[in-house]
Amino acid sequence: QAVPPYASENQTCRDQEKEYYEPQHRICCSRCPPGTYVSAKCSRIRDTVCATCAENSYNEHWNYLTICQLCRPCDPVMGLEEIAPCTSKRKTQCRCQPGMFCAAWALECTHCELLSDCPPGTEAELKDEVGKGNNHCVPCKAGHFQNTSSPSARCQPHTRCENQGLVEAAPGTAQSDTTCKNPLEPLPPEMSGTMLM
């Protein structure tokens, strides 16, 4: 098993993740591990020399970079917030602020926008990842209602009047809850749509 640096006639190295082909010397050399950078390039007589990234800089992968990448804060102006700080091995981890979704993506989210409101009678379809896309509003399923314009309100089950010792005065809709009344009192016309105790 050859240890870098070693000769490579076909310009490929055995371990593509941890080695790279250096064309001037026509050899395979070690890459530097995450959290480090190349402080001295390899040659036929010595392997790559690596050094640790300085504070506030990082390299995420096995690399042959001669510098570390500068840590960047999550930009609140772009609607981003930090979920994990930058380390020598990983860039700052950002996500969209609550109530926002990612509107521009370039390897990572660069710009978040406010989620659209879902109108009464609908709710935002649940997604695998929060903040990945704008709301897709879906109607409340049978027996549920949602009575506000909101990006985050969920459809709630209609009140079951009998569970409260009451009777139904008016059925619930997708946009309103069931109206209940005391079974002993008739519902005056002007009180319809409200619950009487």
Epitope: H25, R26, S43, R44, I45, R46
Partner: antibody, heavy 120, light 107 residues
Framework: EVQLVESGGGLVKPGGSLRLSCAAS????????MYWFRQAPGKGLEWVAT????????YYPDSVKGRFTISRDNAKNSLYLQMSSLRAEDTAVYYC?????????????WGQGTTVTVSS | DIQMTQSPSSLSASVGDRVTITCKAG??????LSWYQQKPGKAPKLLIY???RLADGVPSRFSGSGSGTDYTLTISSLQPEDFATYYC?????????FGGGTKLEIK
């Protein structure tokens, strides 16, 4: 038989330009890294430029970086050295050289050389 | 850059003599050293590569030895055609560097 024949040398004024050529024959030119070396009158040998087999990579010592450009045309089996901003210290015999393409990296064939004189 | 110190810079010897030329590298060059012979007005000619290996067509009176930082070219029995200048070259690390040369003259 491997042959490397340089041409294009001559007398040039300081600050001037010159293009050297090297015609290769007797081997598969596109399989080899090629080099230019030089030798000033009565002096030792000095590496000047390297180009990879496909021409994608070029390398220079600090003494010529930014002034000299090595290139190749594999279809024509030709190597070139474009020299600009020439100085008196660039006066030398320039050799076109082939690097062995195995694992030992020695320089196995040299051209006869072409003379470049930089003088006012 | 790796400095190559070649000695002697000139040497007078007679036909039949055994001659030794040395090259000292500024650091371990792992045998990436070759030797070249150059006659006046001619291009250098490869003699030895990888410190000890004889190039094709080179007479067996030429030999190379050494490792690490110290290398030697030996001509076991000088012939008239051997009077020339000899150069060592390290090609372990760019920039490639030559020794200053040894001019071998007839005594």
């Amino acid at each position: 038989e491997v042959q490397l024949v340089e041409s294009g040398g001559g007398l040039v004024k300081p600050g001037g330009s010159l293009r050297l050529s090297c015609a290769a024959s007797g081997f598969t030119f596109s399989d080899y890294y090629m080099y230019w070396f030089r030798q000033a009158p009565g002096k030792g040998l000095e590496w000047v430029a390297t180009i990879s087999d496909g021409g994608s990579y070029t390398y220079y010592p600090d003494s010529v970086k930014g002034r000299f450009t090595i290139s190749r045309d594999n279809a024509k089996n030709s190597l070139y050295l474009q020299m600009s901003s020439l100085r008196a210290e660039d006066t030398a015999v320039y050799y076109c050289v082939r690097e062995e393409n195995g694992n030992f990296y020695y320089f196995d064939y040299w051209g006869q050389g072409t003379t470049v004189t930089v003088s006012s | 850059d790796i400095q190559m110190t070649q000695s002697p810079s000139s040497l007078s010897a007679s036909v039949g003599d055994r001659v030794t030329i040395t090259c000292k590298a500024g650091q371990d060059i792992k045998s990436y050293l070759s030797w070249y012979q150059q006659k006046p007005g001619k291009a250098p000619k490869l003699l030895i590569y990888y410190a000890t290996r004889l190039a094709d067509g080179v007479p067996s009176r030429f030999s190379g030895s050494g490792s690490g930082t110290d290398y030697t070219l030996t001509i076991s029995s000088l012939q008239p055609e051997d009077f020339a200048t000899y150069y060592c070259l390290q090609h372990g690390e760019s920039p490639w560097t030559f020794g200053g040369g040894t001019k071998l003259e007839i005594k």
